[in-house]
């Protein structure tokens, strides 16, 4: 309910004045009242609302000796660093008994040079690629008209005639500066100058030219780079381990990439020292004097299989009567692919070489026919992948088995498709 109707005369003898100024201005509003008896607290209103955190001071001067005599009360409201939020209608308010009294209003207004709410920002753009810049300013006084400048040259005949809040640039071929001027009745304010750096466009069509087990040759098409020639391109390769999850356009891979630089032209590079039969992801970026382009998406590639780099290890060949036992271990050297099996060759001193495909077993029992009198019988073994045979082992002579020597326990495998081998010259 109201604190009563205002039947009595207002106690205010001085009302707040008006303040109009530019942002940052400091000013004081003042009101004065004369009351009988105990002086009330003076409240300040802005647009009808009590200002709880007002920077105000109240001075009270008695006009007589007695407490019930009249008092002069002066309240001053200080506005420091004037902002748009400070503008409005200001009044003093007092509660006297059951009545509410408000002073006549004073006004606080903002008027000055335009104030930027948003200014163009520095940025990098790819050559010949459209982009937008933003600029926003306000008064009062309104209206505020904007004029964009590129390299200090106005982009319109007059403020307000060209683009306003947003400037659309269809593309640049050289690094340029942009600013905007804000014009109102009080004058002109110029924004910061934004530097737009023109970088090369992202390369296109990254592809494989040739593949070898430990190297890949790749090529790409460079993007436009404006007036700045490309100085070099950088290629990155990273192992795509199972579950690594590099997708097209995914951010940086989880491990340190292998980085190579290519002089340009040609836009081609041989990447060496790779692992054979291994999936990689590669990407490329090209650089001019202004900086690097964005990376291409990661391209999945794979090195082909190679042949094993070494022969099988620890080959032993022993003979016991009509059987020869040969066994070996997987090569210690890199296989460069998926091991598909072993080939075995044997040869007597004066006999032609015989080749056998053993498959993935690491042992074989040869069924010898005759008395085994062939002299200097030697055995060689090689591992092979889909890419071909690895190097053959050195010839291992077939040794006679001596009683007391551990007899290797080998199962003689006689598969229907693989008949027991015989010595055709015996």
């Amino acid at each position: 309910a109201p604190r009563g109707t205002q039947a009595e005369e207002s106690p205010f003898v001085g009302n707040p004045g008006n303040i109009t100024g530019a942002r940052g201005l400091t000013g004081t509003l003042r009101c004065q009242l004369q009351v009988q008896g105990e002086p009330p607290e003076v409240h300040w209103l802005r647009d009808g609302q009590i200002l709880e955190l007002a920077d105000s001071t109240q001075t009270q001067v008695p006009l007589g000796e007695d407490e019930q005599d009249d008092w002069i009360v002066v309240s001053q409201l200080r506005i420091t660093s004037l902002q748009l939020s400070d503008t409005g209608q200001y009044q003093c308010l007092v509660f006297l008994g059951h009545q509410t009294f408000v002073s006549q209003p004073g006004y606080v207004g903002l008027e000055g040079l335009p104030y930027f709410l948003e200014e163009p920002e520095d940025r990098t753009v790819a050559a010949n690629t459209p982009f937008n810049l933003s600029c926003q300013a306000q008064g009062p006084p309104e209206p505020v008209d904007l004029l964009w400048l590129q390299d200090a040259v106005p982009l319109a005949t007059a403020p307000g005639h060209g683009p306003q809040r947003s400037l659309h640039v269809p593309g640049l071929n050289k690094t340029s500066s942009f600013s905007c001027e804000a014009h109102n009745a009080k004058g002109v304010t110029t924004s910061r100058t934004a530097t737009i750096t023109v970088l090369p466009q992202q390369p296109r069509n990254l592809h494989l030219v040739s593949r070898q087990p430990t190297e890949l040759e790749v090529a790409w098409t460079p993007g436009l780079s404006g007036i700045y020639p490309l100085t070099h391109c950088t290629l990155q390769a990273v192992l795509s381990d199972d579950g690594m999850g590099i997708q097209a356009g995914e951010p940086d891979p989880p491990e340190e990439p292998l980085t190579s630089q290519a002089s340009v032209p040609p836009h081609q590079l041989r990447l060496g020292s790779l692992h054979p039969h291994t999936p990689y992801h590669i990407r490329v970026a090209c650089t001019s004097s202004q900086g690097p382009s964005s990376w291409t998406h990661w391209l999945p590639v794979e090195t082909p299989e190679g042949v094993p780099l070494g022969p099988p290890e620890n080959i032993s060949a022993t003979r016991n009567g009509s059987q020869a036992f040969v066994h070996w271990q997987e090569p210690r050297a890199p296989l460069q692919g998926t091991l598909l099996g072993y080939r075995l060759a044997y040869q007597g001193q004066d006999t032609p070489e015989v080749l056998m495909d053993i498959g993935l077993r690491q042992e074989v029992t040869l069924e010898l026919q005759g008395d085994g009198s062939v002299s200097n019988l030697t055995v060689c073994v090689a591992a092979y992948t889909a890419a071909g045979d690895g190097p053959w082992s050195l010839p291992v002579p077939l040794e006679a088995w001596r009683p007391g020597q551990a007899q290797p326990v080998h199962q003689l495998v006689k598969e229907p498709s693989t008949p027991a081998f015989s010595w055709p010259w015996w």
Epitope: D47, Q49, Q89, P105
Partner: antibody, heavy 122, light 107 residues
Framework: QVQLQQSGPELVKPGASVKISCKAS????????IHWVQQRPGQGLEWIGW????????KYNEKFKDKATLTADTSSGTAYMQLSSLTSDDSAVFYC???????????????WGQGTLVTVSA | DIQMTQTTSSLSASLGDRVTISCRAS??????LNWYQQKPDGTVKLLIY???RLHSRVPSRFSGSGSGTDYSLTISNLEQEDIATYFC?????????FGGGTKLEIK
């Protein structure tokens, strides 16, 4: 006691203007703010703006700046709102309300008019 | 502008029930939250101001609480005359804004 008495319903044609009134009594008209509020059919309330009759100063919600004009006549203790370029979208009940000064600050409306229905129809 | 949201647009309750209506502001409104009652005939009355202060001649079964952005109005013992639509309003920052309203009906 404080009372706000609003004018009766209005039926107006699209494109026309209408002026509705709010007569205040029971308090010092020039010491308080009169606010105006719109309520479209079946909708919530929207603040339009205020006028301070003691100075004729006004403040508008940006949304209603070009639609409403607030005035006051201190001799009769009446506040007015003129609505211009009316469309069927402007059909609504319009309320006037009075503010209240309190130590705590804030703005609320303890006194409301009964509302004026404005119907815009060809 | 500060958005005021009353998520429940209508509510059914029985006479004697305790009913709570909520209101959320899109930013902190410093307790400057007021509740109004609009009767079916369009009459609007202030119930609560400054979050929890009861306006004069408002029955004590109405109460308000909240802080920051979340506020509520509670009717402790619903009576027939409380059938109305209830609106919240923020009085912190211009423009003053209202919630969409919660219509209270009797089951």
């Amino acid at each position: 006691q404080v009372q706000l008495q609003q004018s009766g319903p209005e039926l107006v044609k699209p494109g026309a203007s209408v002026k509705i009134s709010c007569k205040a009594s029971g308090y010092s008209f020039t010491s308080y703010y009169i606010h105006w509020v719109q309520q479209r059919p079946g909708q919530g309330l929207e603040w339009i703006g205020w006028i301070y009759p003691g100075s004729d100063n006004t403040k508008y919600n940006e949304k209603f700046k070009d639609k409403a004009t607030l005035t006051a006549d201190t001799s009769s203790g009446t506040a007015y709102m003129q609505l211009s370029s009316l469309t069927s979208d402007d059909s609504a009940v319009f309320y006037c309300a009075r503010n209240y000064y309190d130590y705590d600050g804030g703005t609320w409306f303890p006194y409301w008019g009964q509302g004026t229905l404005v119907t815009v129809s060809a | 502008d500060i958005q005021m949201t009353q998520t429940t647009s209508s509510l059914s309750a029985s006479l004697g029930d305790r009913v709570t209506i909520s209101c959320r502001a899109s930013q902190d409104i410093n307790y400057y939250l007021n509740w109004y009652q609009q009767k079916p005939d369009g009459t609007v009355k202030l119930l609560i101001y400054y979050t929890s202060r009861l306006h004069s001649r408002v029955p004590s079964r109405f109460s308000g609480s909240g802080s920051g952005t979340d506020y509520s109005l509670t009717i402790s013992n619903l009576e027939q005359e409380d059938i109305a639509t209830y609106f919240c309003q923020q009085g912190n920052t211009l423009p003053w804004t209202f919630g969409g309203g919660t219509k209270l009906e009797i089951k």
